[in-house]
């Protein structure tokens, strides 16, 4: 999104007119106080969208936040929005009006809050006072937001001086509500276990001294009760923990485990749940497909990534042509396997500045005592084409030949073209393609060889020109998936005693 003027803060004159423009790659809209003011939306020929918001006859009440956002955020990568703050200094407006609910600030804990008294002029000095006191409180002020800090249960007003008159804001009332809310957290030593292993869950409550725990779990539904153990965490005040321990888990123990905590004084309650999976044995799963043919470009770096799940934690090895790979001291190969969640892993093989010799058959093997996977792929090193030779000769037969030789991986395609008008071609006239079967005046013979050692293709193409009656610019273009290369030669008729 592009906003003009960019802001992020503007100071505009009262009674003036001002234009805000926002543009983006998708429909955009201006928002003010969660409303969409009247604005002009348009779409340009280049596909960009814009919205123009014209602010007319500005007053101090136009002071505030303006947002430009995508009109329809579906399908967009980000909910991007641009914020602009406009001040319209207006001596007739003291403090900007507040909604009634903004005047009452309720807290349930000691936390920073903002008393939202705002003025229209960023140059004004604003002070905060207790309602019944004259002493200014040492609280930082932000002209766009108000006074932010930790406040006691009192009434507060803001004061400023506009010209020669002192202006007071409405009173703000801060109330701290004493609520011993229950905050439950549940965690498991492991959320995936093999049958026969133990399930251990912990439910922790903070900030209360007397609570009652109740667990629900799959075994309970079948009447097989497990007695939880409750303890106090001595190093943390008011931390109470209930432990549910199920030895030798069975497949039927898979499911949802819920800890419900009640506190009888205020009759508060909270519950949290966690899913436990019991598997018949350890496992390995692949989450995405890795193609059996992978590509890397010569001298570029390439990372091959495998995402998988496994339990218990696996050993991961990489092989090339059945030989074990390790991090190379020269820094040409880097291997890493990261545990990104309890059972999910990302294994990466990074080839730094790829060399032709690194083409081959790669395998990642992830295994533990119960299961394994061997994921294999062929790595092809793509080499940009280059024309190695372009030469012209005059055999005795009277025809003229042009030979083009080049290499690359994957196999290069060859395109022959010619320009008969050397002055105008190729800038003004497009070159003529040669070697089509319909063309009788030229014949083409192309041979392709694969060089095992260098792991690349060599193309040799010979163009036979039957009769050349004037100088001809012949161009050989080799092209493959990773590039193209061109060379040109001027072919002159036999009759001309010189070459250009």
């Amino acid at each position: 999104l592009v906003v003009t003027p960019p802001g992020p803060e503007l100071v505009l004159n009262v009674s003036s007119t001002f234009v805000l423009t926002c543009s983006g790659s998708a429909p955009v809209v201006w928002e003010r106080m969660s409303q969409e003011p009247p604005q002009e939306m348009a779409k340009a020929q280049d596909g960009t969208f814009s919205s123009v918001l014209t602010l007319t006859n500005l007053t101090g009440l136009d002071t505030g936040e303006y947002f430009c956002t995508h009109n329809d955020s579906r399908g967009l990568e980000t909910d991007e929005r641009k914020r602009l703050y406009i001040f319209v200094p207006d001596p007739t407006v003291g403090f900007l009006p507040n909604d009634a609910e903004e005047l009452f600030i309720f807290l349930t804990e000691i936390t920073e809050i903002t008393i939202p008294c705002r003025v229209t002029d960023p140059q004004l000095v604003v002070t905060l006072h207790e309602k019944k006191g004259d002493v200014a409180l040492p609280v930082p002020y932000d002209h766009q937001r108000g006074f932010s800090g930790i406040f006691e249960d009192r009434s507060y007003i803001c004061k400023t001086t506009i010209g020669d008159r002192e202006v007071d804001s409405d009173a703000y009332y801060v109330y701290r509500l004493q609520v011993s809310s229950i905050n439950v957290s549940v965690n498991a030593v492991q959320t995936v276990v093999r049958q026969g292993e133990n399930i251990t869950l912990m439910c922790i409550v903070i900030g209360n001294e007397v609570v009652n725990f109740e667990w629900t779990y799959p075994r309970k539904e079948s009447g097989r009760l497990v007695e939880p153990v409750t303890d106090f965490l001595l190093d943390m005040p008011y931390h109470i923990r209930s432990i549910l321990h199920i030895p030798s888990a069975e497949l039927e123990d898979s499911g949802t485990y819920t800890c419900n905590v009640t506190e009888s004084v205020n009759d508060h309650q909270d519950e949290k749940a966690i899913n436990i999976t019991v598997v018949e044995s350890g496992y390995v799963r692949l989450l995405g497909e890795v193609g059996t043919l992978q590509f890397a470009e010569l001298h570029r770096s390439r990372t091959l990534q495998v995402v998988f799940e496994a339990y218990p934690p696996p050993t991961v090895l990489w092989f090339k042509d059945n030989r074990t790979l390790g991090d190379s001291s020269a820094g040409e190969i880097a291997l890493s396997t990261r545990n990104v969640s309890e059972t999910r892993y990302v294994s990466e093989l990074t080839l730094v500045r790829v060399k032709v010799a690194e083409a081959g058959h790669y395998t990642m093997r992830a295994f533990h005592e119960d299961a394994e996977v061997q994921l294999s792929f062929q790595l092809q090193i793509n080499v940009p084409v280059r024309v190695l030779e372009l030469s012209e000769s005059h055999p005795d037969s009277g025809e003229q030949t042009v030979r083009c030789r080049g290499r690359g991986m994957p196999q290069p395609n060859i395109i022959w073209s010619a320009c008969r008008d050397l002055k105008r071609c190729p800038r003004e006239l497009p070159p003529t393609l040669l070697g089509n079967s319909s063309e009788e005046e030229s014949q083409l013979e192309t041979n392709v060889t694969y060089w095992e050692e260098e792991q690349e293709f060599e193309v040799v193409s010979t163009l036979r020109l039957q009769h050349v009656d004037r100088p001809l610019s012949v161009r050989c273009t080799l092209r493959n998936a990773v590039g193209q290369d061109t060379q040109e030669v001027i072919v002159v008729p036999h009759s001309l005693p010189f070459k250009v």
């Epitope: 598997v279 018949e280 044995s281 496992y283 390995v284 799963r285 692949l286 989450l287 995405g288 497909e289 890795v290 193609g291 059996t292 119960d370 299961a371 394994e372 996977v373 061997q374 994921l375 294999s376 792929f377």
Partner: nanobody, 124 residues
Framework: EVQLVESGGGLVQIGGSLRLSCAAS????????MGWFRQTPGKEREFVAA????????GYADSVKGRSTISRDNAKNMVYLQMNSLKPEDTAVYYC?????????????????WGQGTQVTVSS
């Protein structure tokens, strides 16, 4: 949805070989990871071998590793398990299974389609 039919089971001598085949119906065969499992009376079905959707991922249970090869032919909608050097403990009903939840898995519960099974008996 995919239907699976196993074949190739039978009676074989110790040290002998068998090739189990699994024919799958449906046009989206290449979007399924495939596995072979086996079960003996009174025991749970156990993993034998699995192969990923494109054939690039394979894995075996330790009990058959080095003696078995899993392969697939996506053009023919077929999965194969070549078993060599058979032992009496390989006697079981062998099941072919398919999953579209993962591109490869060794876990029985991940497989949502199963064949009827084919009996393999290894005798002396």
């Amino acid at each position: 949805e995919v239907q699976l039919v196993e074949s190739g089971g039978g009676l074989v001598q110790i040290g002998g070989s068998l090739r189990l085949s699994c024919a799958a119906s449906g046009r989206t065969f290449s979007s399924y990871a495939m596995g072979w499992f086996r079960q003996t009376p009174g025991k749970e079905r156990e993993f034998v071998a699995a192969i990923g959707r494109n054939g690039g991922s394979i894995g075996y249970a330790d009990s058959v590793k080095g003696r078995s090869t899993i392969s697939r032919d996506n053009a023919k909608n077929m999965v194969y398990l070549q078993m060599n050097s058979l032992k009496p403990e390989d006697t079981a009903v062998y099941y072919c299974a398919a999953t579209n939840k993962f591109s490869y898995s060794t876990l029985r519960n991940d497989y949502n389609y199963w064949g009827q099974g084919t009996q393999v008996t290894v005798s002396s």
